[in-house]
Interface confidence: low
């Protein structure tokens, strides 16, 4: 009986304190794992950089909604 596979947990311990221009963002991932110290959002920029952000910040929420709309429009 093999051991269960261990999946690494991604957590955000610090969040960015400035706004990232929306045109630089490519996608986002929500961090809601109860083992993480805080709920957060990881934005991936078009240059491939990943940045933690606070989902309580309005610019973060607006950016998420903007990306949602882009992906919605890409659906056939």
């Amino acid at each position: 009986q093999p051991d269960s596979v261990s999946i690494p947990i991604t957590c955000c311990f610090n969040v960015i304190n400035r706004k990232i221009p929306i045109q630089r963002l490519e996608s986002y991932t929500r961090i809601t794992n109860i083992q993480c110290p805080k709920e957060a959002v990881i934005f991936k920029t078009k240059r491939g950089k990943e940045v933690c952000a606070d989902p309580k910040e309005r610019w973060v929420r607006d950016s998420m909604k903007h990306l949602d709309q882009i992906f919605q429009n890409l659906k056939p």
Epitope: R30, D62, D68
Partner: antibody, heavy 128, light 110 residues
Framework: QSLEESGGDLVKPGASLTLTCKAS?????????MCWVRQAPGKGLEWIAC????????TYYASWAKGRFTISKTSSTTVTLQMTSLTAADTATYFC?????????????????????WGPGTLVTVSS | AYDMTQTPASVSEPVGGTVTIKCQAS??????LSWYQQKPGQPPKLLIY???TLASGVPSRFKGSGSGTEYTVTISGVQSDDAATYYC????????????FGGGTEVVVK
């Protein structure tokens, strides 16, 4: 539990004025904003600005308020609104309100703001 | 940018009747909508948030509904105490927004 505004006054056009909002018994928690909303006599509500009550202190303004109005969190229980170059059109009752985040996951179902606590308002009159 | 249009500007209804107030956003606000009641000389009071959730202590005769750009608050079995001005407010975005509130609807109870 209350919010109370102060600083309203009769001022001349072109003057500056600072309003203060003091919270007592109200949670200035991580998941809330402190905001200013105004209401001209006999008119509707007009949002001015909000400041994140959490550590970031991020500020948000109505497009018409940028530049002339400045919202600041001056302590854990106090928020101010600085107003410059006042005109007769700025005559109004200025309300302080707490904008709470109804914080649920996943998006976009949650993080709905609503102003759940309001002060009684302070009257600003701009007249020569 | 996310302008809120409320209709009608005024409505008169007898006690026991039904009042419907509509709020239309210029763009989809994804249920990021609240309703407030304001009586003369008082600050507004939160009635409904998240388009349809009643705030604490609000009577069940108030009902919020809608999605996308169109939202409604309905007062069934209106009472004299419901005479007030009602405002909708979007919280979908604060970017390039002139006002988050609708223009208001005065409800007169006959």
């Amino acid at each position: 539990q209350s919010l109370e505004e102060s600083g309203g006054d009769l001022v001349k056009p072109g003057a500056s004025l600072t309003l203060t909002c003091k919270a007592s018994g109200i949670d200035f928690s991580l998941y809330s904003y402190m905001c200013w909303v105004r209401q001209a006599p006999g008119k509707g509500l007009e949002w001015i600005a909000c400041v994140d009550a959490g550590a970031s202190g991020s500020t948000y303004y109505a497009s018409w308020a940028k530049g002339r109005f400045t919202i600041s969190k001056t302590s854990s229980t106090t928020v101010t609104l600085q107003m410059t170059s006042l005109t007769a059109a700025d005559t109004a009752t200025y309300f302080c309100a707490r904008g709470i985040l109804y914080y649920t996951w996943p998006y976009p179902a949650g993080a709905i703001d609503a102003f759940d606590s309001w002060g009684p308002g302070t009257l600003v009159t701009v007249s020569s | 940018a996310y302008d809120m249009t409320q209709t009608p500007a005024s409505v008169s209804e007898p006690v026991g009747g039904t009042v419907t107030i509509k709020c239309q956003a210029s763009e989809s606000i994804s249920n990021y909508l609240s309703w407030y009641q304001q009586k003369p000389g008082q600050p507004p009071k939160l009635l409904i948030y998240k388009a349809s959730t009643l705030a604490s202590g609000v009577p069940s005769r108030f009902k919020g509904s809608g999605s996308g750009t169109e939202y409604t608050v309905t007062i069934s079995g209106v009472q004299s105490d419901d005479a007030a001005t009602y405002y909708c407010q979007q919280s979908y975005s604060s970017s390039n927004v002139f006002n988050t509130f609708g223009g208001g609807t005065e409800v007169v109870v006959k």
